[in-house]
């Protein structure tokens, strides 16, 4: 993503004591220069000159793309899903070759009844979306199908989907045990062979906000972390205020470097500040010595 953020320049002193001007860049930061036509702009860190300003790549911003942003947008999916591959054996319908053709009237009627039956079976599962028949084969009718589950993304989405898949297993086992043929007759919507019920595979959406955060932070990956607010993940550096991991720079400004977050301490007319967190103030002398 591209970012253009205007930045002002302030006189600051690093916690080591030297006065510097920000925006600034750590000497270890890689620098690339983008030159377009007659316009020469020092767009650093992969940024490029668009004719007016530097267009910066994540996680950089500033007039020359020399500063590191305090937070990076990460976008978890709105919903996450699971797909269960199941096999059940339906005994209340006899297999015919037409069932192999998904555009046949036989398949359409079977699909309608099977879907209705499964909707009844899974009606108490809020994550349940539906079923999709993938294959029908002889025996009476062996039904290979997918059960689709979906839920809103939360940090606990895997637990929610894991729990839902367990309930699916319980419910399909129950119905295929209870709805069985008696004297070659079925009084239910569908009857099953109890031993034909199998869960072949379960696939759950994989989304890791920490991984997305680290990837987008690039060489700063060790210093960006994920914190949650209202169940939404935020990819932040310690320089972002208002989070548990936020660095308090007191009388200074937080700045990211490739060695992590550091405080750049301010110097006022009356005090200069030092220390790792710019919390050590020293009053300036009122006497000025002229040489």
């Amino acid at each position: 993503p591209l970012a253009t953020i205007p930045v002002s320049t302030t006189s600051l002193t690093s916690s080591e004591g030297s006065t510097i001007s920000t925006p600034s860049v750590d000497i270890s930061t890689p620098v690339t220069t983008s030159i377009v036509g007659d316009q020469c702009s020092r767009c650093k860190n992969g940024g490029f000159w668009d004719g007016l300003k530097c267009q910066c790549l994540t996680p950089y911003y500033g007039e020359s793309c020399e500063e590191v942003v305090n937070s990076i947008d990460i976008a978890p999916p709105e919903t996450v899903s699971a797909q269960m591959e199941l096999t059940v054996t339906v005994t209340s319908v006899k297999f015919t070759d037409e069932l192999k053709n998904h555009s046949s009237q036989e398949f359409r009627e079977f699909n309608k009844t099977f879907t209705e039956q499964m909707n009844i079976v899974y009606s108490g599962i809020p994550e349940y979306v539906g079923v999709n028949i993938t294959n029908l084969r002889l025996g009476s009718v062996v039904v290979e199908h997918d059960v689709l589950l979906r839920t809103k993304y939360t940090p606990e989405y895997k637990t929610a989907l894991d729990n839902a898949t367990e309930v699916v297993k319980q419910k399909i086992t129950k119905v295929t045990t209870e709805q069985i043929m008696t004297n070659d007759n079925c009084s239910a919507l569908m009857c099953f062979n109890t031993t034909g019920t199998q869960v072949q595979n379960i696939t759950v959406t994989q989304y890791d906000p920490v991984e997305e955060c680290r990837q987008k932070a690039e060489e700063y990956e060790d210093y960006f972390l994920v914190e949650y607010r209202d169940q939404k993940p935020y990819c932040i550096s310690p320089c972002e205020s208002g989070f548990n991991a936020s660095k308090n720079c007191n009388h200074g400004k937080c700045q990211m470097s490739q060695n992590g977050a550091r405080c750049l301490c301010v110097t006022t007319e009356t005090h200069w500040y030092s220390g790792e967190d710019c919390n050590q103030g020293t009053q300036k002398s009122h006497h000025h010595h002229h040489h």
């Epitope: 005994t91 209340s92 319908v93 006899k94 015919t96 037409e98 009237q105 036989e106 009627e109 079977f110 309608k112 009844t113 209705e116 043929m181 070659d184 007759n185 079925c186 009084s187 239910a188 919507l189 569908m190 009857c191």
Partner: nanobody
């Protein structure tokens, strides 16, 4: 799409007979399943007599020995011969069909229905 039209219903005295017919349009008569269901006032629809193309037949216990299901493939017609009729046989009789070879008595598994014909057994 299969279309079903029943006929032959009416009023009959206890012990009497009726023959219901169900004419089917479409080319699916030789395959699948065919049947007769009935629904008495205030009761659920129930299977009376069913037949599938692989030879399976079903009769409700209450009609065994009295009712006979048959079909004439050349005429695309299903029949229900009802003998020794009783007052409790009074109901609307529905013809049902499915292209599937079914073994189920549950009306929800049957996809095609006629509009029904009324049978009243009364003295």
């Amino acid at each position: 799409e299969v279309q079903l039209v029943e006929s032959g219903g009416g009023v009959v005295q206890p012990g009497g007979s009726l023959r219901l017919s169900c004419a089917a349009s479409g080319d699916t008569f030789s395959r699948g399943s065919w049947g007769w269901f009935r629904q008495a006032p205030g009761k659920e629809r129930e299977a009376v007599a069913l037949i599938s193309s692989d030879g399976w037949t079903f009769y409700a216990d209450s009609v065994k020995g009295r009712f006979t299901i048959s079909q004439d493939n050349s005429k695309n017609t299903l029949y229900l011969q009802m003998n020794s009729l009783r007052a409790e046989d009074t109901a609307v009789y529905y013809c049902a069909a499915s292209v599937l070879v079914l073994r189920t008595l549950n009306p929800k598994a049957w996809h095609h229905w006629g509009q029904g014909t009324m049978v009243t057994v009364s003295s």
